[in-house]
């Protein structure tokens, strides 16, 4: 099939001790090969500070996956979710303020 770019969605949820869990979800993409990683100041976080979900079929002939990490509250601006898929790429910020969701569809 032809390439279908991912929809990327960044969410954050508060956890204890001033840390936040930020999750980056990529969905509705094809083919299944994708790079999804968290960056701090543009530098990829080490593997042992991130958790990845499996790349799974979403039932529509496309795929979905996610990556999460914990960051210090107040440092959201330093972090972005970096995505590479079929020659396209993008960086996605952690939502600031009261907005806890950020969607972006790659073309």
């Amino acid at each position: 099939g032809s390439t279908v770019p991912p929809m990327v969605n960044v969410t954050c949820s508060e956890v204890s001790e001033g840390n936040i869990t930020v999750t980056c979800r990529a969905s509705s993409f094809y083919p299944r090969n994708i790079t999804l990683t968290w960056r701090q100041d543009g530098v990829s976080l080490s593997h042992n500070t991130q958790q990845w979900g499996d790349v799974l079929p979403d039932g529509n002939g496309t795929y979905q996956t996610w990556v999460a990490t914990r960051i210090r509250q107040g440092e959201e601006q330093r972090f972005t979710c970096y995505m590479e898929h079929s020659g396209n790429h993008g960086t996605h910020p952690v939502p600031s303020g009261n907005s806890h969701h950020h969607h972006h569809h790659h073309h």
């Epitope: 100041d41 543009g42 530098v43 601006q77 972005t80 970096y82 790429h89 993008g90 996605h92 910020p93």
Partner: antibody, heavy 118, light 108 residues
């Protein structure tokens, strides 16, 4: 081959502004941050700020926030550093650098000497 | 702000000798955020070691890095003529990003 090519040396009067450019090639410009660092004569390295060219986000060292503007033109793969209200202490070599996969500064421009003198 | 203090300021050694450079941080830094750079006169710095102990591309194996917490070390096992330069440590854990003041390795 990744390359960062900076504009030429500048001589400015105190109170003036200067704009230094950094043209990137050999990689997808919007996939990495561009950092700016300066080095006064015989001194160490000082981080000024960075820009994420994909989303346009800029993070400044608070020490420079009032006088520095960092921009990027994705159509030409060029980043810019503008410094206003120049004083003699701003005399330095200004470097651009690219964020790496595992470190903050993996490739560097050749540097631009900015001399502030009356 | 995390202050990085490098010692000694100058190290005078002969080719073939071992060089040990120290970088001390004012606050603890994760090893993922400590990097080393080499700078020769009239040139831009170049990445030498990333994440405390990993050699950057094209860097010879005589260079090594170690450390944790607040104390980090760059070691050159046997100095070659091209190694005489200034070395900077840098932290990326907290803003502002900061560098040490540098250690100059000069020929004795």
């Amino acid at each position: 081959e990744v390359q960062l090519v900076q504009s030429g040396a500048e001589v400015k009067k105190p109170g003036a502004s200067v704009k230094v450019s950094c043209k990137a090639s050999g990689y997808a410009f919007t996939s990495n941050n561009i950092y700016w660092v300066r080095q006064a004569p015989g001194q160490g390295l000082e981080w000024i700020g960075y820009i994420d060219p994909y989303i346009g986000r800029i993070i400044y060292n608070q020490q420079f926030k009032d006088r520095v503007t960092i921009t990027a033109d994705t159509s030409t793969s060029t980043a810019y550093l503008e410094l206003s209200s120049l004083r003699s202490e701003d005399t330095a070599v200004y470097y651009c650098s690219r964020s790496g996969e595992r470190s903050n500064f993996d490739y560097w421009g050749q540097g631009t000497l900015v001399t502030v003198s009356s | 702000e995390i202050v990085l203090t490098q010692s000694p300021a100058t190290l005078s050694l002969s080719p073939g000798e071992r060089a040990t450079l120290s970088c001390s941080a004012s606050s603890s830094i994760s090893s993922n955020y400590l990097h080393w750079y080499q700078q020769k006169p009239g040139q831009a710095p170049r990445l030498l070691i990333y994440r405390t102990s990993n050699l950057a591309s094209g860097i010879p194996a005589r260079f090594s890095g170690s450390g944790s917490g607040t104390d980090f070390t760059l070691t050159i096992s046997s100095l070659e003529p091209e190694d005489f330069a200034v070395y900077y440590c840098q932290q990326g854990g907290s803003l502002p990003l900061t560098f040490g003041q540098g250690t100059k390795v000069e020929i004795k």
